[in-house]
Interface confidence: low
């Protein structure tokens, strides 16, 4: 004799009782009305299950909540099913059996039918697990039911102080979707909030789960697929006041079936968005965008931000959105890099792009900018990186494309190629009024526009000039004079420079900033405009340092232990971290601080010049780093502002030293023998290079390195030319924000 093996199968769901109505006290679990009605409803549920062939498998059940409309009962029940029958009793089959029973006019009128008129149409059965029930039960001391009327924004009452877990059960009108807004009110906490596309905390219906006060998403809006959602909070430690605010709204389903016709031009023409962007897309999202292109000369480019597409096997679900583009199935995934999907045009009827959520787990809304590109020349003057669809500088000594193809087959790497005989000359010798090429091709077209390329400077009117690094050199090279605009920068003040010394003098580095918390120097930085200081993003990675309110910025400072008349201090009104910054890899290690009031420039306080994207800092060039960092590895911060000269290092050499962990957004400087380097406390400080014009340009920001001044390990800096577009974007967008 062998005992039959059974498995516990958990089902969760809801049913509507047509001859009962919801009342407020049924929404309160502690009320007598709730206790008496739930006991009766549970008996009804038990009898309903017992009236079917499922009765023999019945283990236990619970009606844990009631909802609006004709009275909605939310329940779970457990069946102990023989192992061999487990797959045959899916939620769909169980629902069918229960509906058949509700519709049957059996002569043995079950007692539940006398008291409860259950609507068979409204029966919902979902798959659940024992763990889901455990989670649900842990919230029952703080269970909140809310019905969300259309048009109202309903603030949800925060959790009770005594409880460690709460559940907000949200319900709205059947033809609308629930949208929850979660706002973290602190930068550091360890609370957990999970949102489910169901009335209860069903793991299989999880939309999203956030742990700790999310600095990346201080405010998030999340959509359910329909009119029901559950939000579960689990207390972190030390939350002696609520670290978040919750509110909810019922919103209409938004259509995303669009037909668009593009114009024959190459700039961005618009965007495609998931409904209610930037809200999380709903688990029921299905978008279909049809784009018509004016001619087959063009291809279609989709520009993504922190989201990319890749091929996925057909038997694998896409967990972050499925894309169908010209019958190609692609899966979306979040990434800390830019990405473009290029769609070559083969037929004149355009292209259809479908986006679908395949699972309940969703993510931040997706926004895609679209533009056309020239199919015969997709990246004028640059290299098309097939890995990520981006146009990148070619042959500049930096492998921008993950496969490194932008630096392959280069006749002249980071140099100018003479037309006559393909000899290479260094870039500073181009347009310097001194012919170096055999027939002087390096000095041709220096007064006129040229096709844009890796080392050409782009003027404001989008034309390009051949002369490298023409910014602020005292000569107007652009027709519109834009290369000589915004040039109140990069000049030293009182400079009585101590050549070869290590201690700086007043006014020598007037852009140098000291970023402090409670009077303690934490990081360096550089003044780049009258309200902006640039620094490293990693200075803010500790939760306890993430709030702008904590920071004070000192400019014109010389000594840490004393103040002098030339120095000024500012509070920080806003902090902008690069959206692609990644702590582990140090990539995109840049942040901008907006000061609480404008800086008055003086001999000791003055901004450094920002380089254009095309600005070329030549490997081998001697530049300077400054800061109050430690003067030896593991040592204390310095009292007096230190300076040290370092040599710019070729990217491939540095990449080798650091086992290829050096990204295109990084720049290396130092010496093979070590000794001269930045150290702890210098982070975020400037690496500046002097142009022949006498102006100092910001080449890098102190970012990371192995130890300080160790032989064969150079200092690694954020390469400003690779993040300059983001810097300009922030400065432009927030120019008037006070």
């Amino acid at each position: 004799y062998k005992a039959e093996v059974t498995v516990s199968q958990v089902y969760s769901g809801s049913l509507r009782v047509l001859n009962r109505h919801f009342s407020q006290d049924l929404g309160r679990r502690e009320s007598i009305a709730f206790r008496s009605e739930s006991a009766k409803a549970q008996k009804m549920l038990q009898e309903l299950v017992a009236s079917t062939r499922l009765g023999t498998y019945y283990n236990s059940s619970s009606v844990y909540s009631f909802g609006e409309g004709p009275l909605t009962c939310f329940f779970w029940f457990i069946l102990d099913i023989p192992e061999y029958q487990r797959l045959t009793l899916s939620p769909e089959v169980v629902r069918e059996l229960l509906v058949d029973e509700l519709l049957s006019n059996s002569s043995t009128l079950a007692s539940y039918k006398t008291e409860y008129e259950v609507d068979p149409e409204g029966l919902v059965i979902l798959e659940a697990s024992v763990n889901d029930i455990v989670v649900l039960n842990s919230t029952l001391g703080c269970y909140r039911y809310s019905y969300v009327n259309p048009g109202q924004v309903l603030p949800l009452k925060g959790p009770d102080q005594q409880t460690t877990s709460c559940l907000w059960h949200l319900q709205g009108p059947e033809d609308l979707m629930i949208k929850v807004r979660l706002e973290w009110t602190r930068v550091d906490c360890r609370d957990r909030v999970a949102m489910y596309d169901a009335a209860g905390p069903l793991e299989k219906r999880l939309i999203t789960s956030v742990y700790g006060c999310s600095r990346q998403e201080p405010v998030m809006e999340v959509l359910a697929s329909g009119s029901v959602m559950a939000v579960v909070w689990k207390k972190g430690m030390h939350s002696y006041y609520d670290p978040f605010l919750l509110s909810v709204k019922s919103v209409a389903f938004q259509d995303c079936q669009v037909n668009l016709t593009l114009e024959g031009r190459l700039d961005t023409q618009g965007f495609l968005r998931t409904p209610y962007y930037p809200s999380y897309y709903s688990p029921s999202t299905h978008c279909s965008w049809h784009l018509t292109v004016p001619s087959l000369d063009y291809g279609l480019a989709l520009w993504f931000d922190a989201y990319a597409l890749r091929r996925q096997k057909y038997n694998r679900l896409c967990t972050q959105g499925q894309w169908m583009i010209q019958n190609r199935r692609l899966c979306g995934f979040r990434t800390l890099q830019p990405y473009a999907e290029r769609i070559p045009m083969v037929a004149s009827d355009g292209v259809t792009i479908n986006f679908t959520s395949q699972i309940s787990l969703t993510g931040p809304g997706v926004q895609v900018y679209y533009s056309l590109y020239n199919q015969s020349d997709p990246c004028p003057g640059e290299f098309l990186c097939s890995v990520n669809g981006l146009c990148v500088p070619a042959c500049d000594g930096i492998k921008d494309c993950p496969n490194g193809l932008d630096e392959r087959n280069c006749v002249c790497r980071a140099m100018f190629q003479c037309q006559e005989d393909s000899t290479c000359i260094s870039l500073p010798r181009v347009c310097d009024r001194q012919p170096d090429c055999l027939n002087g091709s390096d000095e041709e077209q220096c007064q006129e526009g040229v096709p844009c390329g890796t080392f050409t400077f782009q003027c404001e009117d989008r034309s390009c000039v051949k002369k490298p690094n023409p910014e602020c050199d005292g000569q107007s090279d652009c027709r519109d004079g834009s290369d000589e605009q915004h040039c109140d920068c990069g000049l030293q003040g009182l400079s009585s420079r101590i050549v070869g010394g290590t201690v700086s003098s007043e006014g020598e580095w007037p852009w140098q900033a000291s970023l402090q918390i409670r009077g303690r120097h934490i990081c360096g930085g550089a003044l780049i405009a009258d309200r902006w200081v640039i620094t490293a993003a990693h200075c803010f990675q500790e939760d306890s340092m993430a709030s702008p309110k904590l920071w004070t910025v000192f400019l014109g400072k010389m000594r840490q232990n004393s103040r002098w008349p030339g120095e000024v201090s500012f509070k920080v009104s806003r902090l902008f971290l690069h959206p692609y910054h990644e702590e582990d890899s140090h990539d995109y290690d840049v942040a901008l601080l907006q000061l609480d009031h404008p800086v008055v420039y003086s001999a000791t306080v003055r901004p450094v010049c920002l380089p254009a994207r095309s600005h070329f800092f030549e490997p081998g060039q001697h530049c300077w780093i400054t800061g109050w960092g430690a003067q030896r590895e593991g040592g204390p911060v310095s009292n007096t502002l230190q300076k040290v000269d370092v040599q710019l290092v070729p990217q491939d050499l540095c990449s080798e030293a650091y086992r290829y962990q050096v990204s295109p957004r990084m720049l290396c400087a130092g010496y093979r023998k070590g000794k001269k380097d930045a150290c702890q406390g210098d982070s975020g400080g400037p690496l500046v290079c002097r142009e022949p014009s006498g102006r100092w340009f910001l080449a890098g920001l102190v970012s990371w390195g192995l130890g300080c001044g160790r032989p064969n390990f150079f200092g690694v800096y954020t390469r400003v030319t690779r993040v300059i577009n983001w810097i300009q974007q922030v400065l432009t967008h927030h120019h008037h924000h006070h």
Epitope: T164, D188, G236, M237, H238, Y240
Partner: antibody
């Protein structure tokens, strides 16, 4: 550097109360929790509770809720724990430590040895 | 409450030997685990926090590892000063709970 000063020993009679102190220095007192831990001779460690000097907010181990009362005096940077209705089971060494949700306790006081005897 | 099961309760090891002590939590504690060393009559000394991060000044022969419910402390080459009682602590949820301790002695 971080330091926590605790009196070396306290002697009390059964049924009485004892209030022990923990004076902190070398860090921002109001920014970190103070945790209290009990250790009976030759036994393992038991968490009693936490107090947040910045707000006076407390968390207690259910087992010690009616036994221990945690308070702070921010002006003197001192945390206190009062034990009431003492019995021989309360004879133990009591440690205080600054507590952080990332590091837990990375510095400990020297401990106060409480002896309950008639 | 989260129960911390520490093993072994006591052990003998020779100088230079590799020693491993384990702690198992009754549920996932998300790496919020510390290890302490205590010598007779002294207060505990913190060695490791967040399961694998070494406290400043603790020798590199001491390391911590693990995730979810299972964690361990390893001393790669035992030295005389490593003798003592070792405790683990979970600090993922209140109440904080300690392991029962492992007494490490020299053979």
């Amino acid at each position: 550097q971080v330091q926590l000063q605790q009196p070396g020993a306290e002697l009390a009679k059964p049924g009485a109360s004892v209030k022990m102190s923990c004076k902190a220095s070398g860090y921002t007192f109001t920014s970190y929790w103070i945790t209290w831990v009990k250790q009976r001779p030759g036994q393992d460690l038991e968490w009693i509770g936490n107090i947040y000097p910045g707000s006076g907010s407390t968390y207690y181990n259910e087992k010690f809720k009616s036994k221990a009362t945690l308070t702070v005096d921010t002006s003197s940077r001192t945390a206190y724990m009062q034990l009431s209705s003492l019995t021989s089971a309360d004879s133990a060494v009591y440690y205080c430590a600054p507590y952080d949700s990332d590091y837990a306790m990375d510095y400990w006081g020297q401990g106060t040895s409480v002896t309950v005897s008639s | 409450d989260i129960k911390m099961t520490q093993s072994p309760s006591s052990m003998y090891a020779s100088l230079g030997e590799r020693v491993t002590i384990t702690c198992k939590a009754s549920q996932d504690i998300n790496n919020y685990l510390s290890w302490f060393q205590q010598k007779p009559g002294k207060s505990p000394k913190t060695l490791i926090y967040r399961a694998n991060r070494l406290v400043d000044g603790v020798p590199s022969r001491v390391s911590g590892s693990g995730s979810g419910q299972d964690y361990s402390l390893t001393i790669s080459s035992l030295e005389y000063e490593d003798v003592g009682i070792y405790f683990c602590l979970q600090y993922d949820e209140f109440p904080l709970t300690f392991g029962a301790g492992t007494k490490l002695e020299l053979k």
